[in-house]
């Protein structure tokens, strides 16, 4: 078997064996090495010398195998746009941002650029749980049977109705999607002014 060519090597068909780690240099019609993530081209290749790479300076990065002569500048997560940092910028990776708690991504261009406050879910509903936090606005769904939620909130969850018998009490008024069960002492009638409250 023939030995594998090592960059730089001639290429007549303008393609290189390893598309990820090599690139075609048209001036000399050769295949040269790309620079690995975290580095950039400090000296271009020639027919007798392969690409020379150097590490990106602090606060700059290149994410992929490349033949760039500069590194990209790290950008902070913009709190004015509702973003917060989850992972720092390194020579190999841009700063990783996400929406701040209670916000969702309202504008997406390859990555999130702008977050907005999540909508409130009205009493009797809760926000449908999403696979990824911050991906979309709340979709409010009704509380399932036997549960209630009594506030307007972006994050409140439906809670199970109180079971009066577990507390040695009896039910005075059944729970609804928006209110808990009202319990009373089995020996007392419920006074009119106390309706809608729980008596212990």
């Amino acid at each position: 078997s023939q030995p594998q060519a090592v960059p730089p090597y001639a290429s007549e068909n303008q393609t290189c064996r390893d598309q990820e780690k090599e690139y075609y240099e048209p001036q000399h019609r050769i295949c040269c090495s790309r620079c690995p993530p975290g580095t950039y081209v400090s000296a271009k290749c020639s027919r007798i010398r392969d690409t020379v790479c150097a590490t990106c300076a602090e606060n700059s990065y290149n994410e992929h195998w490349n033949y760039l002569t500069i590194c990209q500048l790290c950008r902070p997560c913009d709190p004015v746009m509702g973003l917060e940092e989850i992972a720092p910028c390194t020579s190999k990776r841009k700063t990783q941002c996400r929406c701040q708690p209670g916000m969702f991504c309202a504008a997406w261009a390859l990555e999130c650029t702008h977050c907005e406050l999540l909508s409130d879910c009205p009493p009797g509903t809760e926000a449908e749980l999403k696979d990824e936090v911050g991906k979309g606005n709340n979709h409010c769904v009704p509380c399932k049977a036997g549960h209630f939620q009594n506030t307007s909130s972006p994050s409140a969850r439906c809670q199970p109705h109180t079971r009066c018998e577990n507390q040695g009490l009896v039910e005075a008024a059944p729970g609804t999607a928006q209110s808990d069960t009202t319990c009373k002492n089995p020996l007392e009638p419920l006074p009119p002014e106390m309706s809608g409250t729980m008596l212990m």
Epitope: P37, E58, S60, E63, A87, P88, S91, K92
Partner: antibody, heavy 121, light 112 residues
Framework: EVQLLESGGGLVQPGGSLRLSCAAS????????MSWVRQAPGKGLEWVST????????YYADSVKGRFTISRDNSKNTLNLQMNSLRAEDTAVYYC??????????????WGQGTTVTVSS | DIVMTQSPLSLPVTLGESASISCRCS???????????LDWYLQKPGQSPQLLIY???NRASGVPDRFSGSGSGTDFTLKISRVEAEDVGVYYC?????????FGGGTKVEIK
């Protein structure tokens, strides 16, 4: 030879302060991020803080945020950890470590011998 | 925070045999440009930790080739192909994809 040597550990009362230092030699100190990692008695490793080569970026574990401050003096090849409002749970051996690659956080390839911090009344 | 779960907790091995340690992460450590933000460390008894593997599968300088790292996404393995007496100690995995950086709980390797 690349070397890291920690100092400044000792016994301190809860609520007290301590300043750890790490003297580096054998490499271009300003070109590398540096970290502090601690190990409580009989327990595993816990990352505490990391600082970039220039000192412009700092990162902290939630358990020490607001109490500990990492800093560096590149002219003296020294890494520091100022520890305030110390708690019993901060008791540990504190290691300083050099990050393998310039401007990265993967691979702490050189570690000091550690300095012991005991927080007790 | 990313949770790193190592298994087993303790691993008795026979000299010359192979050994594998597992590290499972609560979210993927595979970054978009294809590298994996996972390191492996060994802490020998009475010593400071030492770096074995960085970026998932790259051996650190001076580390014997009997150590190898593999895996993708959330499941990773450190393999010691022929265990030697000097390999005893506690092995830790660590993620560096996001702060706070987090370690696994450790796996103690001892000779049977």
């Amino acid at each position: 030879e690349v070397q890291l040597l920690e100092s400044g550990g000792g016994l301190v009362q809860p609520g007290g302060s301590l300043r750890l230092s790490c003297a580096a030699s054998g490499f271009t100190f300003s070109s590398y991020a540096m970290s502090w990692v601690r190990q409580a008695p009989g327990k595993g490793l816990e990352w505490v803080s990391t600082i970039s080569g220039s000192g412009g970026s700092t990162y902290y574990a939630d358990s020490v945020k607001g109490r500990f401050t990492i800093s560096r003096d590149n002219s003296k090849n020294t890494l520091n950890l100022q520890m305030n409002s110390l708690r019993a749970e901060d008791t540990a051996v504190y290691y300083c470590a050099k990050v393998r690659d310039n401007w990265n956080y993967d691979g702490m390839d050189v570690w000091g011998q550690g300095t012991t911090v005991t927080v007790s009344s | 925070d990313i949770v790193m779960t190592q298994s087993p907790l303790s691993l008795p091995v026979t000299l010359g045999e192979s050994a594998s340690i597992s590290c499972r992460c609560s979210q993927s450590l595979l970054y978009s440009s294809g590298y994996i933000d996972l390191d492996w460390y060994l802490q020998k008894p009475g010593q400071s930790p030492q770096l074995l593997i960085y970026l998932g599968s790259n051996r650190a300088s001076g580390v014997p080739d009997r150590f190898s790292g593999s895996g993708s996404g959330t499941d990773f393995t450190l393999k010691i192909s022929r265990v030697e007496a000097e390999d005893v100690g506690v092995y830790y995995c660590m993620q560096t994809i996001q702060t706070p950086l987090t370690f696994g709980g450790g796996t103690k390797v001892e000779i049977k």
